[in-house]
Interface confidence: medium
Amino acid sequence: KAMHVAQPAVVLANSRGTASFVCEYASPGKATEVRVTVLRQADSQVTEVCAATYMMGNELTFLDDSICTGTSSGNQVNLTIQGLRAMDTGLYICKVELMYPPPYYMGIGNGTQIYVIDPEPCPDSD
């Protein structure tokens, strides 16, 4: 079953290559287990950036080597992606799945365009 997901259109990563955005979903029921996946679309290719499953009211748990962290609040997830470079600029899509209890719902946002600008190297000082 389909579900509405919203996310901001544009986000600019900071000078340390970190970008944060919010993903909000309309929960048709009282989901207790939610899975959030961040997908990156660039040059018509879609790749999975990170994913986490969490119990409502608990922290999101990503894999240890994940570049993502996040927190949840109600029907909203605050996602942070770290270690971004200019080449990582692209459309980052939030996919939300209500895993439990049934019925299963899935929604995909329109995507957040994340712009990453590599910092200029500091000039050598004599």
Epitope: A6, P8, E24, Y25, G74, N75
Partner: nanobody, 127 residues
């Protein structure tokens, strides 16, 4: 500074319909939760309905559930309140309000969580 301007109020007979609009200036409209409140003559201002920043989740006072529908068009920076099956007790000045923090998940009906208010538009339900 964002400005909120309501319109669409007027005189309507019981059982009739009205659609209120709230036009917001500025480019940050889509980042904020929005709400409608109303104040009847001699009464305190009360919560009517609210909508989340992305337009995904909506919330209503029990007194208007099933009769009023809140919606938003982020491309047009406009908030709406469709009011059907109007009753005499819906007579009030209707205010739109902007949430206090971008991408908030407070989902509150408390007036204190809204940072900006319009001037209001009068809705009179009478035969």
């Amino acid at each position: 500074e964002v400005q909120l301007v309501e319109s669409g109020g007027g005189l309507v007979q019981p059982g009739g319909s009205l659609r209120l609009s709230c036009a917001a200036s500025g480019r940050t409209f889509s980042s904020y939760d929005m709400g409608w409140f109303r104040q009847a003559p001699g009464k305190e201002r009360e919560f009517v309905a609210a909508i989340s920043w992305g337009g995904v989740n909506t919330y209503y006072a029990d007194s208007v559930k099933g009769r009023f529908t809140i919606s938003r068009d982020n491309a047009k920076n406009t908030l709406y309140l469709q009011m059907n099956s109007l009753r005499a007790e819906d007579t009030a000045v209707y205010y739109c309000a902007r949430g206090s923090a971008p991408y908030s998940s407070s989902r509150s009906s408390a007036q204190e969580t809204y940072a900006q208010w319009g001037q209001g538009t009068l809705v009179t339900v009478s035969s």
